[in-house]
């Protein structure tokens, strides 16, 4: 008889580069046998992972795998950071590898001083 654990398929050092202001879906691939497990997302903050309980999430079911999705509508600059998904089943908790979002703030990127400005006013680098 084959073992039937809930499984989370986020690879080591998974990362996404995204733009602030855009919508984004962060997927946690989940495999389960019978009953769909309770899955949550959390964001790493120091030594703890803070549950994201008030955020919009949804499930996407495919033939051999399901995805528990954390929605960013839109992405904000402070969404930058590392996230984990975790699943509860049979009183066990399993936590995925962390997945990191690198958020580029388009607004601040477009407002960066030019090379000429930085050459004449190097203190702008330290703002």
């Amino acid at each position: 008889k084959e073992s039937c654990d809930v499984q989370l398929y986020i690879k080591r050092q998974s990362e996404h580069s995204i733009l602030a202001g855009d919508p984004f879906e962060l997927e946690c691939p989940v495999k389960y046998c019978a009953n769909r497990p309770h899955v949550t997302w959390c964001k790493l903050n120091g030594t703890t992972c803070v549950k994201l309980e008030d955020r919009q999430t949804s499930w996407k079911e495919e033939k051999n795998i399901s995805f528990f999705i954390l929605h960013f509508e839109p992405v904000l600059p402070n969404d930058n950071g590392s996230y984990r998904c975790s699943a509860n089943f049979q009183s066990n908790l399993i936590e995925s590898h962390s997945t990191t979002l690198y958020v580029t703030d388009v607004k601040s990127a477009s407002e960066r001083p030019s090379k000429d400005e930085m050459a004449s006013r190097p203190w702008l680098l330290y703002r």
Epitope: K1, E2, S3, D5, V6, Q7, L8, Y9, I10, K11, R12, Q13, K31, L44, T47, N64, S82, I94, E95, S96, H97, S98
Partner: antibody, heavy 118, light 106 residues
Framework: QVQLVQSGAEVKKPGASVKVSCKVS????????VNWVRQAPGQGLEWMGM???????DYNSAFQGRVTMTKDNSKSTVYMELSSLRSEDTAVYYC????????????WGQGTMVTVSS | SIVMTQSPDSLAVSLGERATINCKAS??????VAWYQQKPGQSPKLLIY???NRYTGVPDRFTGSGYGTDFTLTISSLQAEDVAVYFC????????FGGGTKLEIK
């Protein structure tokens, strides 16, 4: 129950290749990744790489170009081939199953001794 | 790659006494650390994952702790069957193991 049973000991000449098999039972290779770890005599453990559920691979850069990991889901068997063997490759080679979250190795094969000697 | 430096290389402890093994990562690995026990002639066995979670069937005298770069495996009261080599392993990036600690009875 979960088991990983590896092929028998091998003796190879320098420059040759070796292919070690790992037959699993109690779980499916379409559901779990499998790692390969080696241990030289009296030494520590060295991760060689792994094969994911979809057949994609992730190799330790120290073995890149010399190691190939494959699997046959229908035979529930994973293979690790190491080429251009040298005496430093003499070691016990283990296959090990990834935990359901991929963050540790929970079941290990019994090991396969590979001796490289001229 | 991330280097895991384990100390001490060997340790002799009296039966019933506490044994402490340390592991230091060359960079932060969050809590992505596992500990394994290997007895002579056997394959490694998983003891601890997520740095502090005891694996199924592992006696509660084994405790893992730490976060970031510094990790510890503690055996609160050494038993004869605990004589083995212990390895830490990081799984934050491409997995690497510590060099091992040989635990013996004093």
């Amino acid at each position: 129950q979960v088991q990983l049973v590896q092929s028998g000991a091998e003796v190879k000449k320098p420059g040759a290749s070796v292919k070690v098999s790992c037959k699993v039972s109690g779980f499916s290779l379409t559901g779990y990744g499998v790692n390969w770890v080696r241990q030289a005599p009296g030494q520590g453990l060295e991760w060689m790489g792994m094969i994911w559920i979809d057949g994609s691979t992730d190799y330790n850069s120290a073995f890149q170009g010399r190691v190939t990991m494959t699997k046959d889901n229908s035979k529930s068997t994973v293979y690790m081939e190491l080429s251009s063997l040298r005496s430093e490759d003499t070691a016990v080679y283990y296959c090990a199953r990834d935990r359901p979250d991929g963050r540790a190795m929970d079941y290990w094969g019994q090991g396969t001794m590979v001796t490289v000697s001229s | 790659s991330i280097v895991m430096t384990q100390s001490p290389d060997s340790l002799a402890v009296s039966l019933g006494e506490r044994a402490t093994i340390n592991c230091k990562a060359s960079q932060s690995v969050s809590n992505d650390v596992a500990w394994y026990q290997q007895k002579p002639g056997q394959s490694p066995k998983l003891l601890i994952y997520y740095a502090s979670n005891r694996y199924t069937g592992v006696p509660d005298r084994f405790t893992g702790s730490g976060y970031g770069t510094d990790f510890t495996l503690t055996i609160s009261s050494l038993q004869a069957e605990d004589v083995a080599v212990y390895f830490c392993q990081q799984d934050y990036s491409s997995p690497t193991f510590g060099g091992g600690t040989k635990l013996e009875i004093k």
